[in-house]
Interface confidence: medium
Amino acid sequence: QAGPLPKPTLWAEPGSVISWGNSVTIWCQGTLEAREYRLDKEESPAPWDRQNPLEPKNKARFSIPSMTEDYAGRYRCYYRSPVGWSQPSDPLELVMTGAYSKPTLSALPSPLVTSGKSVTLLCQSRSPMDTFLLIKERAAHPLLHLRSEHGAQQHQAEFPMSPVTSVHGGTYRCFSSHGFSHYLLSHPSDPLELIVSGSLEDPRPSPTRSVSTAAGPEDQPLMPTGSVPHSGLRRHWE
């Protein structure tokens, strides 16, 4: 007897982080034997949507013409072949930005920092939030979460980096969010350019948690100091 049908692949174009009002297409790719594709959204009645396969039948398209809060969430897809339904795909997390006003990102004491010194990136929101995210452009593991204990409402999160090396240089943005839906983010902050001066032969900081071996130097997650920040926010790696 044949084993279970292989799970399909699920992805979003142009990406899984979409601004409010923009269009997004969710693709589910199975096999040439697929007769039907089904998309399920977590905490929504199943199926969330069904589509016939596009020729040559190995994938289906689920279109969202205008992104809103209702579409943000966690999705899985399946396909049906003559022998039954496939295993579920790995989940796709569709995140909407623009749910809240943009925070402000600043560097203390300065965005110009000498290698080996310390800098703190400060993300401030005008409304109290319980989750803050710091994103570095062009990083494979860009997200660093700070989530407050017990849902405390904070107006800022501190992302300390020490010692700073050339790896930390680059462009950062931050987002704020409420814990009740981490699929809804604020508008992004204006970008902050962190410029690290000093020797290019600085020793690489060792990550506080292991990262994918496929990650290159620019793909390392941020390395903040310490395990628990002072602000009552708990750190989560993504």
Epitope: S101, S127, H155, Q156
Partner: antibody, heavy 121, light 107 residues
Framework: QVQLKESGPGLVQASETLSLTCTVS????????VNWVRQPSGKGPEWLGR???????VYNLTLESRLSISGDTSKNQVFLKMNRLRTDDTGTYYC???????????????WGQGTLVTVSS | ETVMTQSPTSLSASIGERVTLNCKAS??????VDWYQQTPGQSPKLLIY???NRHTGVPDRFTGSGFGSGFTLTISNVEPEDLGVYYC?????????FGPGTKLELK
């Protein structure tokens, strides 16, 4: 010129409800955040809550069950209601405005002159 | 809630003297601290916002500094009109809380 003016009854009985109005001029409530702050005589100020047209209301959790803040942007007014009054609610009640529309720092940059509320038993 | 403590409770200064007022937060509040001056019968007046920025019209003898949980307000040359009570305020987390105040008196 930025102006805030509080109005309401000077004397309220314990267990009753206090209703105060903050009437603003020189700026729009759709652009700025307005906070309510009170100060018992001889003591430090205490933040009560805030009204922000596009970002909702935030309350001091210790008073949240007794507080309600609302606004009428067309009349340039923000309202505070506090029920189940106690004698220790006596003090001067102020409304304040933040420094700029970004609303990140300097939240109590402009203050009204305050209105004295006495809660009698 | 974040508790703000101020020291000293009161201090006496001579005209022209330099004084430093301290404010400590029970947890980090970033730079979300303002300083206010209140004179008898008046509403509090914003001096410093965001830890270190002087509000419009505030003389440059007032300087604020600090980050995280420790903050200071320095008055470099005390003038007679500086007398009153100084409060720090944190708005890093809800509820926003004031310190108990430092009373500045004339020697």
């Amino acid at each position: 010129q930025v102006q805030l003016k509080e109005s309401g009854p000077g004397l309220v009985q314990a267990s009753e409800t206090l209703s105060l109005t903050c009437t603003v001029s020189g700026f729009s409530l759709t652009s700025y955040c307005v906070n309510w702050v009170r100060q018992p005589s001889g003591k430090g100020p205490e933040w009560l809550g805030r009204f922000w047209y596009d970002e909702g209301k935030v309350y001091n959790l210790t008073l949240e069950s007794r507080l309600s803040i609302s606004g009428d942007t067309s009349k340039n007014q923000v309202f505070l209601k506090m029920n189940r009054l106690r004698t220790d609610d006596t003090g001067t009640y102020y409304c304040t405005r933040d420094r700029d529309t970004l609303g990140i720092t300097g939240w109590f940059a402009y203050w009204g002159q305050g209105t004295l509320v006495t809660v009698s038993s | 809630e974040t508790v703000m403590t101020q020291s000293p409770t009161s201090l006496s200064a001579s005209i022209g003297e330099r004084v430093t007022l301290n404010c400590k937060a029970s947890q980090s509040v970033g730079i979300n601290v303002d300083w206010y001056q209140q004179t008898p019968g008046q509403s509090p007046k914003l001096l410093i916002y965001g830890s270190a920025n002087r509000h419009t019209g505030v003389p440059d003898r007032f300087t604020g500094s600090g980050f995280g949980s420790g903050f200071t307000l320095t008055i470099s040359n005390v003038e007679p009109e500086d007398l009153g009570v100084y409060y720090c305020l944190q708005y890093g987390s809800v509820p926003y809380t004031f310190g108990p105040g430092t009373k500045l008196e004339l020697k």
